[in-house]
Amino acid sequence: GSERTCCPVNWVEHERSCYWFSRSGKAWADADNYCRLEDAHLVVVTSWEEQKFVQHHIGPVNTWMGLHDQNGPWKWVDGTDYETGFKNWRPEQPDDWYGHGLGGGEDCAHFTDDGRWNDDVCQRPYRWVCETELDKASQEPPLL
């Protein structure tokens, strides 16, 4: 496979990763698929420094990240360990609130207007951030 050594056009490089910030909204699953089509993933926040970087770029706008608990426990889309990793939830979040009247609870995490995290209904059309790592071989699958 080939290694990506610089970020694609319209992506922002930071600490050996590339970030892309949407200008419109999609449901969490559609945002996740969009990032995958770009050979990326929804942003995985692993440090306070990365949190501040993303927060600076998205501003005070609800924005999806690559964290969900649709199958039970909270999981990052790239396999980063949730339990031992960085967290920045709002007070009393996540709460899996059922009172929204949309059916079910809240299974997808997003940045809120102050940057802290909240769980919300995955179907809400929020903006999103894609991330891909530099110097990572793009494991091209073998041809069948």
Partner: antibody, heavy 121, light 107 residues
Framework: EVQLLESGGGLVQPGGSLRLSCAAS????????MSWVRQAPGKGLEWVSA????????FYADSVKGRFTISRDNSKNTLFLQMNSLRAEDTAVYYC??????????????WGQGTTVTVSS | DIQMTQSPSSVSASVGDRVTITCRAS??????LAWYQQKPGKAPKLLIY???SLQSGVPSRFSGSGSETDFTLTISSLQPEDFATYYC?????????FGQGTKVEIK
């Protein structure tokens, strides 16, 4: 000039297999997602499958999931569609298409001329 | 899946006419909509993306508008080469889906 050229279509019996190819030229193939779209005789367009630039991530219509496999060889600038367990309803002209992008992926901006697949006994 | 419904299914018009085709999505798709033109025996051609952005090389008589569920393709002054079938396509959610097509015929 940006070009896509499909090949591999033909007549195949129900339950049979076929592999379509799409040769790309005139652009940096590995940096673009690609797609297959089909059109049954006298019918409209139906999206079949898409694949990311590296080939790692793939997407399928429910009608072909588990039977068709999209792949690509970026060293040869070629897109593939492996079609197994073919059915009469898979009979169509198959087009490969490049996904254009500016800030977003926005649509299929370059299309091949199409290759005809006929599934019949 | 998101259903895309075009109307009318066909329209008869004369050269110079203003032609409007509508496309309705079964749920909101923001502006994730493209329009294509297809002539018999030929591959489709991208006309409009992001609901209202004109693809490079496409004549300015073509325009698109709308957002969420209701979209329009307008040909301001129909030319002989515009007689064709037009399709809308949503790219908001997989599976991507097309409208059933609108055939623009000579009156």
């Amino acid at each position: 000039e940006v070009q896509l050229l499909e090949s591999g279509g033909g007549l195949v019996q129900p339950g049979g297999s076929l592999r379509l190819s799409c040769a790309a030229s005139g652009f940096t193939f590995s940096t673009y997602a690609m797609s297959w779209v089909r059109q049954a005789p006298g019918k409209g367009l139906e999206w079949v499958s898409a694949i990311s630039g590296s080939g790692v991530n793939t997407f399928y219509a429910d009608s072909v999931k588990g039977r068709f496999t999209i792949s690509r060889d970026n060293s040869k600038n070629t897109l593939f569609l492996q079609m197994n367990s073919l059915r009469a309803e898979d009979t169509a002209v198959y087009y490969c298409a490049k996904l254009g992008k500016d800030y977003y992926y926005y649509g299929m901006d370059v299309w091949g001329q199409g290759t005809t697949v006929t599934v019949s006994s | 899946d998101i259903q895309m419904t075009q109307s009318p299914s066909s329209v008869s018009a004369s050269v110079g006419d203003r032609v409007t085709i509508t496309c309705r999505a079964s749920q909101g798709i923001s502006s994730w909509l493209a329009w294509y033109q297809q002539k018999p025996g030929k591959a489709p051609k991208l006309l409009i993306y992001d609901a209202s952005s004109l693809q490079s090389g496409v004549p300015s008589r073509f325009s698109g508008s709308g957002s969420e569920t209701d979209f329009t393709l307008t040909i301001s002054s129909l030319q002989p080469e515009d007689f064709a079938t037009y399709y809308c396509q949503q790219a908001n959610s997989f599976p991507w889906t097309f409208g059933q097509g609108t055939k623009v015929e000579i009156k």
